[in-house]
């Protein structure tokens, strides 16, 4: 039994890091393998992650981590019984994939303005809380070409757009994702989408 593709890990910078790897053949990850991880810090304890299958030869492990900060560095040991298959390290702050924003809501009762709001996926005492910026994707269910991205580079989790920038009388969907420039993160997954019917009063033509 050998590792074909070494583990690569990403952290949500809150409580979970996800590591994926591939073996050289079909493997029952949960019964045959264990991923041990330990913070390089005084008093730290070794933890064991039981991997799940991710395709025939693929494995995935969800590492539980408390109080993740930039200085953290973890040793990783992949074991098959008594055999050490791979040894490495992982610094969560250098491989961050933020959690997806939640509670996306479209407020249509503001005069001819659409207000989109969502929730920051981190609590205020998490270091990512004040460093997230967002991308909002709006698209028409009727017209695949009517697809747009709004970059929200301020910290407030909201976006205002004029209803007239979208077509009236049709349904739209929106979703939002997040990233943090200061940690050079990847984009989060998209939030669940929300749907609304866009309607506004056309201005009278002279």
């Amino acid at each position: 039994m050998k590792v074909l593709q070494e583990p690569t890990c990403v952290s949500d910078y809150m409580s979970i890091s996800t590591c994926e790897w591939k073996m050289n053949g079909p493997t029952n990850c949960s019964t045959e393998l264990r991923l041990l991880y330990q913070l390089v810090f005084l008093l730290s304890e070794a933890h064991t992650c039981i991997p799940e299958n991710n395709g025939g030869a693929g494995c995935v492990c969800h590492l539980l981590m408390d109080d993740v900060v930039s200085a953290d560095n973890y040793t990783l040991d992949l074991w098959a019984g008594q055999q050490l298959l791979w040894k490495g390290s992982f610094k969560p702050s250098e491989h961050v994939k933020p959690r997806a924003p939640g509670n996306l809501t479209v407020h249509t009762n503001v005069s001819d303005t659409l207000l989109l709001t969502w929730s920051n996926p981190y609590p205020p005492d998490n270091y990512l809380y004040n460093h997230l910026t967002y991308a909002v994707n709006i698209w028409s269910e009727n017209d695949p070409a009517d697809f747009r991205i709004y970059n929200v580079t301020y910290l407030e989790p909201s976006l205002r757009i004029a209803a007239s920038t979208l077509k009236s009388g049709i349904s739209y969907r929106a979703r939002v994702r997040a990233w943090a420039q200061c940690y050079n993160t990847t984009w989060s997954e998209w939030s669940p989408s929300t749907k609304w019917h866009n309607s506004y009063r056309e201005p009278f033509e002279q």
């Epitope: 390089v40 810090f41 005084l42 008093l43 730290s44 304890e45 408390d66 109080d67 900060v69 930039s70 200085a71 953290d72 005492d125």
Partner: antibody
Framework: QVQLVQSGAEVKKPGASVKVSCKAS????????MHWARQAPGQGLEWMGI????????SYAQKFQGRVTMTRDTSTSTVYMELSSLRSEDTAVYYC?????????WGKGTLVTVSS | QSVLTQPPSVSAAPGQKVTISCSGG????????VSWYQQLPGTAPKLLIY???KRPSGIPDRFSGSKSGTSATLAITGLQTGDEADYYC????????????FGTGTKLTVL
């Protein structure tokens, strides 16, 4: 919100022991390390030790080895720092602080005066 | 005995800029991250900077940190009278299983 509430001021005689408490609230107590530091009057900060509330393991600064004991009570989300064989130079404000590599939350401090 | 050296005192007029240095070695600052704490008279220290240069929520951008080699610097611009306090750098010692260490402290006086 995160709060670390420390016990009140103490006056002790040389040779006695003191036990200072630090009650945590507003977060998952066992998920964060707790440090203790002290500050003598007009002096700088001095690290004393650390406790992992999850398992109760500790590590102490060499200077305090054998004199300091840090414990925790998960049922009340409280950590304790006991310093024995007190001498006049132990007169200081004692702080608990939450964190690993740096400390974002601090208790207000407990003044311990050692005087005969 | 602290192995991180800071100037005992610095001073500047309101609105000016001041810097506070923190000098260490390869087994601490050179191989670690630096944090900075502000201690107003009669109060507990407060985290100003972590990760060498990042600010926690609520800390104004007048405060900034940097690190180069075995030294670190805290800069405060647009000085205000309320900034008068003691400032401490902090890091950890990689030669003693990551025990934290503090600087000697710097008293900032706003003239």
């Amino acid at each position: 919100q995160v709060q670390l509430v420390q016990s009140g001021a103490e006056v002790k005689k040389p040779g006695a022991s003191v036990k200072v408490s630090c009650k945590a609230s507003g977060y998952a107590f066992t998920s964060y390390y707790m440090h203790w530091a002290r500050q003598a009057p007009g002096q700088g900060l001095e690290w004393m030790g650390i406790i992992n509330p999850s398992g109760g393991s500790t590590s102490y600064a060499q200077k305090f080895q054998g004199r300091v004991t840090m414990t925790r009570d998960t049922s009340t989300s409280t950590v304790y720092m006991e310093l024995s064989s007190l001498r006049s130079e132990d007169t200081a404000v004692y702080y608990c602080a939450r964190g690993k590599w740096w400390w974002q939350y601090w208790g207000k401090g407990t003044l311990v005066t050692v005087s005969s | 005995q602290s192995v991180l050296t800071q100037p005992p005192s610095v001073s500047a007029a309101p609105g000016q800029k001041v810097t506070i240095s923190c000098s260490g070695g390869s087994s601490n600052i050179g191989n670690s991250y630096v944090s900075w704490y502000q201690q107003l008279p009669g109060t507990a220290p407060k985290l100003l900077i972590y990760d060498n240069n990042k600010r926690p929520s609520g800390i104004p951008d007048r405060f900034s940190g940097s690190k180069s080699g075995t030294s670190a610097t805290l800069a405060i611009t647009g000085l205000q009278t309320g900034d008068e306090a003691d400032y401490y750098c902090g890091t950890w010692d990689t030669s003693t299983t990551y025990h934290p260490i503090f600087g000697t402290g710097t008293k900032l006086t706003v003239l």
